[in-house]
Interface confidence: medium
């Protein structure tokens, strides 16, 4: 979690002198409670916006907007603490609006916005706005919270942001997977315009189950420049496993901008349709494919006789 660096943060508006400060997320009013505290924010809204840094990079940001209730407690409102919590890491970042002048009622409702918290693709956040000073220990809460889910890099607007482009969002491999026969699976995909290697992970599952009964990793060396944007195909040798029939193929690129953390693309081949009178399936789960000459052991990572070609 971080703040967008593009310019000085402002919270002043006509009728209010205000400054934005970094916050430890532990306002002084927690430690030294006040007798009179303002009411909670009203109509907290969080939206996905996009903003450029000074360097011209485009980032997704949380656009936070709220209004004040029209009660006399605004006379005691000294500011607000904005907190963003990333739910999967428990990382929290806060800023504080410090009002340098007293708020007065005016003909329209006071409205505040802040759009400088940079958020990550495919992450969920809890956004909280606390009015300051915070309430006494048993006082009514004067904050409002909302959860905010950031779309992943498949989202049209997200796809062109710097974090998504860095993780390879512009690459569309257009994967096709075809069962050639009971022992062979053919994977076709489009190479990107970078001389980097790829990894194909084949994971097979029994019909209707999520425990893998087969896993195999295949390495594809870096293509030459003349092969960029061309179709590449790989033929993977399977074993005719009874019941181990649903195959998921995942392609992981290793682009220089994202290394081990590039976006992975996958495609799935479903189990064939059951005939009207199916053969009885034994209650055991066979595992692996026959050894081929190039393979050291038959196991989860170096099943032999997979090979690949690049098409022009």
């Amino acid at each position: 979690l971080r703040l967008l660096d593009h310019r000085a943060l402002v919270c002043s508006q006509p009728g209010l002198n205000c400054t934005v400060k970094n916050s430890t997320c532990l306002d002084d009013s927690w430690i030294h409670p006040r007798n009179l505290t303002p009411s909670s924010p009203k109509d907290l809204q969080i939206q996905l916006h996009f903003a450029h840094t000074q360097q011209g990079d485009l980032f997704p940001v949380a656009h936070i907007e709220w209004t004040l209730q029209t009660d006399a407690s605004i006379l005691y409102l000294e500011g607000a603490e904005l907190s963003v919590l990333q739910l999967n890491t428990n990382e929290r970042l806060c800023v504080r609006f410090e009002f340098l002048s007293k708020l007065r009622h005016h003909h329209r409702r006071w409205r505040f916005t802040f759009s400088h918290f940079v958020v990550d693709p495919d992450q969920e956040y809890e956004v909280t706005v606390h009015h300051l000073p915070k309430p006494i220990p048993d006082g009514d809460p004067n904050h409002q919270s909302k959860n905010f889910l950031v779309p992943d890099c498949e989202h049209a607007r997200m796809k062109v942001t710097t974090p998504c482009m860095s993780s390879g969002s512009l690459w569309d491999p257009n994967i096709t997977v075809e069962t050639l026969d009971t022992q062979h699976l053919r994977v076709d995909f489009t190479l990107w315009n970078e001389s980097t290697h790829y990894q194909i992970l084949l994971t097979s599952f029994p019909h209707m189950e999520n425990h893998s009964c087969f896993e195999h990793m295949h390495h594809i060396p870096a293509p030459r420049p003349e092969e960029f944007h061309q179709r590449s195909n790989v033929t993977l040798t399977l074993r005719n496993l009874k019941g181990c029939c649903r195959h998921q193929v995942q392609i992981q690129p290793f682009f220089s901008s994202c290394l081990n953390d590039c976006l992975r693309h996958s495609a799935t081949v479903s189990c064939p349709e059951m005939p009207d009178t199916p053969e009885p399936i034994p209650d055991y789960m066979p595992l692996w494919e026959p050894r081929s000459g190039s393979s050291d052991y038959k196991d989860d990572d170096d099943k032999g006789s997979s090979h690949h070609h690049h098409h022009h």
Epitope: E215, Y284, W288, D299, D300, D301
Partner: antibody, heavy 116, light 107 residues
């Protein structure tokens, strides 16, 4: 050369949990799965389960389902096996081994003693 | 699950003699069978995989044969360092299962 180095011996009370680590070196950790096998004193070998170091997929022995959790930390090339609700018959040497099916390298073993 | 049965439980052999160890599966495991050697206080050591292929660094006196349900590990001429417990293991079906072991001792 390939090495799997396991954490030290543990003594636990019934009902407690134990977490055994297995640090791999000498090869690319995410290319090979890690399996766990245990051996009770004077007894044979018992397969406990397997974890894919690449995808995180797991497959556990039916009798341990619900009590065992296998995890990996690819940043340190370490696999972990946690066993909960320990009973006296869980007293055994616990081995990690490389690969999913046929085990070509083994850790030195970790003795876990469960005793009140 | 597939039950692996090893026989005999103990085999007494003199150094230099031939030792033949048997492993039987309760149903076919094709050639998906491995043999391991274990000495007291040590981890198992891989000897054979795919029923008949020697693992890296394993002496030629160790050989494996069989497919389906019946498998054999043969040590052509026992050396002093070969006295140990030997386990077979099938990896054709989940759960993976081991035989109970054969102890090869000095006669």
């Amino acid at each position: 050369q390939v090495q799997l180095v396991q954490s030290g011996a543990e003594v636990k009370k019934p009902g407690a949990s134990v977490k055994v680590s297995c640090k791999a070196s000498g090869y690319t950790f995410t290319r090979y799965g890690i399996s766990w096998v245990r051996q009770a004193p004077g007894q044979g070998l018992e397969w406990m389960g397997w974890i894919s170091t690449y995808s995180g997929n797991t497959n556990y022995a039916q009798k341990l389902q619900g009590r065992v959790t296998m995890t990996t930390d690819t940043s340190t090339s370490t696999a972990y096996m946690e066993l909960r609700s320990l009973r006296s018959d869980d007293t055994a040497v616990y081995y990690c081994a490389r690969r999913q099916l046929y085990f070509d390298y083994w850790g030195q073993g970790t003795l876990v003693t469960v005793s009140s | 699950e597939i039950v692996m049965t090893q026989s005999p439980a103990t085999l007494s052999v003199s150094p230099g003699e031939r030792a033949t160890l048997s492993c039987r599966a309760s149903q076919s495991v094709s050639s998906n069978l491995a043999w391991f050697q274990q000495k007291p206080g040590q981890a198992p050591r891989p000897l054979i995989y795919d029923a008949s292929t020697r693992a890296t660094g394993v002496p030629a006196r160790f050989s494996g044969s069989g497919s389906g349900t019946d498998f054999t590990l043969t040590i052509s001429s026992l050396q002093s360092e070969d006295f140990a417990v030997y386990y077979c293991q099938q990896y054709d079906n989940w759960p993976l299962t081991f035989g109970g072991g054969t102890k090869v001792e000095i006669k």
